[in-house]
Interface confidence: low
C-alpha cells in the first residue's frame, strides 16, 4: 500500500490519544533500554509501511500481534485516514483469521513492540516537539 496520501496529522493525533497508551500498556514492566532499536524509517510514509509490517505480519518468534488492542486501533486509524487502505487489507485479514491467537507475551514480541514504539516516535516526533 502507498501511504503517501494518508492524513498524517490525523494519524498522529490518534496515536497520541490511544495507540501509544496501548503500546505502553503492552510493554508494562519492560524498560525501553532492554531492547536495541534495529528497525528504522526515513520518512513518514515509510514509517507507516514499517509500522504496518511489524504490527500485522507474523514473524517466526512472534506469531501475531494483530489481535492486540494497539493493533486493532492501528488498523482502524489507517483505514480511517489512508484512502483505499481498507480494501487492500481484506485478503490479509482473511488470512489472519486462520492463525491462532498468541497466548504468551514472548520476549520476541516485546522486542517487536519496542521496535514499534521507536517507529511511532519517529513518525510523531514533529507533533510532540510542537506541544
Amino acid at each position: 500500500y502507498d501511504f503517501t496520501n494518508c492524513d498524517f496529522q490525523k494519524i498522529e493525533a490518534d496515536y497520541l490519544r490511544t495507540i501509544s497508551k496501548d503500546l505502553i500498556t503492552y510493554m508494562s514492566g519492560t524498560k525501553s533500554t532492554d531492547f536495541n532499536n534495529t528497525v528504522s524509517c526515513s520518512n513518514r510514509p515509510h514509517c507507516l509501511t514499517e509500522i504496518q509490517s511489524l504490527t500485522f505480519n507474523p514473524t517466526p518468534r512472534c506469531a501475531s500481534l494483530a489481535k492486540e488492542m494497539f493493533a486493532r486501533k492501528t488498523k482502524a486509524t489507517l483505514a480511517l485516514w489512508c484512502p483505499g487502505y481498507s480494501e487492500t487489507q481484506i485478503n490479509a485479514t482473511q488470512a489472519m483469521k486462520k492463525r491462532r491467537k498468541r497466548k504468551v507475551t514472548t520476549n520476541k514480541c516485546l522486542e517487536q513492540v519496542s521496535q514499534l514504539l521507536g517507529l511511532w516516535r519517529r513518525f510523531i516526533r514533529t507533533l510532540l516537539k510542537k506541544q
Epitope: 503517501t4 515509510h46 519517529r122
Partner: antibody
Amino acid sequence: QVQLVQSGAEVKKPGASVKVSCKASGYTFTSYWMHWVKQAPGQGLEWIGVIDPYDADTTYNQRFKGKATLTVDTSTSTAYMELSSLRSEDTAVYYCTRSLDGFFDYWGQGTLVTVSS
Amino acid sequence: DIQMTQSPSSLSASVGDRVTITCRASENIYSYLAWYQQKPGKSPKLLVYFAKTLAAGVPSRFSGSGSGTDFTLTISSLQPEDFATYYCQHHYDTPWTFGQGTKVEIK
C-alpha cells in the same frame, strides 16, 4: 522563517580534511532530518548522507562511507559534515538540506570546497 | 540503488511554450518523487513532492504527475524565470538518488 546558513568556501590541499557547518534557525532543529548533497562543478546532485538530530543516528550513501562524517550540535542547532583524505574529485559545492518525508524543502546556500595542490 | 533517468537532458523553448520533462525510476517508487529547480550559482528549490503536490509558493503553471516508475513535470506556459535546470529525486528510501538533470534553455 526557516534558514540554513553554511560556512564559507574552503581551499584545501590533497590529503587534508575539511569540516563544513550548517546552522539552522526558524524551526525545531531536532524535528527534521538533516541531509548533505554534493554537486561537482557542472554536474548533477548526489546525496551524501543524513543525520537525525534527535538522536544523531546517521545513514550514509555507500559511496561516501569513510569519506564523510556527519555530526550535530543540538545546543547551537548546527549540523556538520567532515570530509577526510581530500582528493581533487572532492572539489564541489556541498549543500545541507532538511527533510521530514525524504524530499528537501529548505537548502543551505552551499559551501564550495576546492581541493588543489 | 534506485536509478533515476531524466529526459531530455536539455531542451530549447520559448516563453509561453508548454514544457514536459520526464523521469523514470529503475523500480517502483509509488508516489515518492520530488522535482527541484536550480538556477546557476543558486541552491535547488523544491517544486513538487509526492509526485503531484505543489510546494508552498510554487506557481500553478508547474504540475507533477505519474506513479510507479514513470513521472512527468509540466510547465504549462514557460516564463522567463523558468529557464533553469530541473532535477527529479526519489524519496522512497535511502539512498536517495537524483536524475541527471534537464536544462531548459531559451530558444
